[in-house]
């Protein structure tokens, strides 16, 4: 007995091929003997089936002796074996019909599960195999589970149903929503414009939720709330913002927020929440700003940095195209009496120099 | 062809009120942000009022927020601009225009409609 | 609310010259800037969005950059009909701010 595979929502055409090249009379019948459809002359005539507005032929084919069945808009519970009747002759074919889907959304929140289900006929003992987007392969039977899902599992899955060494296969678009990076640093001089940028890893045609922006300064012994907005259809809309530092939110998408200034007092580090409508959890994504001051009280020459920098940068203090004065891994260097000339506050990691600044010492007389 | 047209301007006393309209045709109405601007006779463009396609967020510049108030009807296709408690300078010709998609600009206006405030 | 600081306010020329026409933004605005034409009694038109995008029929010579919150709008060889006043407007977010306008006269 013949054995084909078919998709829930697709449609197949099983084949029968009578040995006389021309068109002769045919019956296609299911398990229980139920016609489902044949011919009369050149007409199509249809049985009580169940499957009687889903199933055709192609009469084109008749005269050719094929008098294939068309099953459109296939369920799962037309698996059956199919009787083609003709010329005395009986061929038969088992249709099983599978069908896989993700058990809740295909969008969901970085760090969620996927569950993708298969449904198959009873008495059937497929086995499924998917592929993520970046190449990972996961195995099981009538259910799939990927935990912690990644930015990089967005994409297209791919499963392969096997049975009666015969396979389908599935095509599914899973979205994964998140921002494209889950942490940025910020490296700015002191008085300088600041922008952070918190751009989706993702595009949805309406895009509909709420945020906040987190902030915790360095010098501050608690966080506080800068601002909360709304995302209406990718309109962004501020609702509160703290009146220090002024900050500005821009109404498109990416999200998008500056501030005047870079100050001491701003160093530190943020977290962005973003709500999605119809989503549970959030999405999130950590901002720093690192803050550059260069400074000459009297006789001392001083370089401080404010906000979270690893232990591995590197502070110095040179004179322009000079060999640097000073370079430790702190977050503050000094020169005392320092030459006339213009000096360098940099910040670097392994030689890589992260924030520049420049301070003018004037010769004393 | 998108067509915005201004009306209801005209001599007003201070402490007075107008209502400007705004009809438009060639566009489906919700889809775009919409924004009133206004210059004064002799001096530069002023943006006024904005609404969202959706018409649920209203904006408006510091100079008229309490006293003018912006809303569209989608059904009608037409742009309000509601302005209470007018004072001298307020006097200016008022234009509609309307945003691109996903707001990249102000790509079509109106030819505006004057507002006179005066005793 | 952003501050739009154009220069000049204005400024005579000749045809054929290049002009340039700069805006300051009071706060970083991505490239979320437009460059508008006014002719006398006639409603703006815009010239170009977002910086540097070129409406569609506007002429080539008509350009926009950006160096961090300094925006420029450059004409590189002036034509009759570009005798005019021009604005910016940042569309970054609300309450929109235009720039007080550069009157582009003839010399």
């Known amino acids: 007995k013949k054995v084909v595979l078919g998709k829930k929502g697709d449609t197949v055409e099983l084949t029968c091929t009578a040995s006389q090249k021309k068109s002769i009379q045919f019956h296609w019948k299911n398990s229980n003997q139920i016609k489902i459809l044949g011919n009369q002359g050149s007409f199509l005539t249809k049985g009580p089936s169940k499957l009687n507005d889903r199933a055709d032929s192609r009469r084109s084919l008749w005269d050719q002796g094929n008098f294939p069945l068309i099953i459109k808009n296939l369920k799962i519970e037309d698996s059956d074996t199919y009787i083609c009747e003709v010329e005395d002759q009986k061929e038969e074919v088992q249709l099983l019909v599978f069908g896989l889907t993700a058990n809740s959304d295909t969008h969901l929140l970085q760090g969620q599960s996927l569950t993708l289900t298969l449904e198959s006929p009873p008495g059937s003992s497929p086995s499924v195999q998917c592929r993520s987007p970046r190449g990972k392969n996961i195995q099981g039977g009538k259910t799939l589970s990927v935990s912690q899902l990644e930015l990089q599992d967005s994409g297209t899955w791919t499963c392969t149903v096997l049975q009666n060494q015969k396979k389908v296969e599935f095509k599914i678009d899973i979205v994964v929503l998140a921002f494209q990076k889950a942490s940025s640093i910020v490296y700015k001089k002191e008085g300088e414009q600041v922008e952070f940028s918190f751009p989706l890893a993702f595009t949805v045609e309406k895009l509909t939720g709420s945020g906040e922006l987190w902030w915790q300064a360095e010098r501050a012994s608690s966080s506080k709330s800068w601002i909360t907005f709304d995302l209406k259809n990718k309109e962004v809309s501020v609702k509160r913002v703290t009146q220090d530092p002024k900050l500005q939110m821009g109404k498109k998408l990416p999200l998008h927020l500056t501030l005047p200034q870079a100050l001491p007092q701003y160093a530190g580090s943020g977290n962005l929440t973003l709500a999605l409508e119809a989503k549970t959890g959030k999405l999130h994504q950590e901002v720093n700003l690192v803050v550059m001051r260069a400074t000459q009280l009297q006789k001392n020459l001083t370089c401080e940095v404010w906000g979270p920098t690893s232990p591995k940068l590197m502070l110095s203090l040179k004179l322009e195209n000079k060999e640097a004065k000073v370079s430790k891994r702190e977050k503050a260097v000094w020169v005392l009496n320092p030459e006339a000339g213009m000096w360098q506050c940099l910040l670097s990691d392994s030689g890589q120099v992260l924030l520049e600044s420049n301070i003018k010492v004037l010769p004393t007389w | 062809e998108v067509e915005l047209l201004e009306s209801g301007g005209g001599l007003v006393q201070p402490g007075g009120s107008l209502r400007l309209s705004c009809a438009a045709s060639?566009?489906?109405?919700?889809?775009?942000?919409m924004s009133w601007v206004r210059q004064a006779p002799g001096k530069g463009l002023e943006w006024v009022s904005g609404i969202s396609g959706s018409g649920e967020n209203t904006y408006y510049a510091d100079s008229v927020k309490g006293r003018f108030t912006i809303t569209s009807d989608n059904s009608k296709n037409t742009l309000y601009l509601q302005m209470n408690s007018l004072r001298a300078e307020d006097t200016a010709v008022y234009y509609c225009?309307?945003?691109?998609?996903?707001?990249?600009?102000?790509?079509?206006w109106g030819k505006g409609t004057t507002v006179t405030v005066s005793s | 609310a952003i501050q739009m600081t154009q220069s000049p306010s204005s400024l005579s020329a000749s045809v054929g010259d290049r002009v340039t026409i700069t805006c300051r933004a009071s706060?970083?605005?991505?490239?979320?800037l437009g460059w508008y034409q006014q002719k006398p009694g006639k409603a703006p038109k815009v010239l170009i969005s977002e910086t540097s995008s070129l409406q569609s029929g506007v002429p080539s010579r008509f350009s926009g950059s950006r160096s961090g919150t300094d925006f420029t709008l450059t004409i590189s060889s002036l034509q009759p009909e570009d005798f005019a006043t021009y604005y910016c407007?940042?569309?970054?977010?609300?309450?929109?701010?235009f720039g007080q306008g550069t009157k582009l006269e003839i010399k």
């Open positions: 407007l940042q569309d970054y977010t609300y309450p929109y701010t």
């Open positions: 060639g566009l489906t109405f919700s889809t775009f942000a």
């Open positions: 706060h970083g605005i991505r490239n979320d």
């Open positions: 225009a309307k945003e691109g998609y996903n707001w990249n600009y102000m790509d079509v």
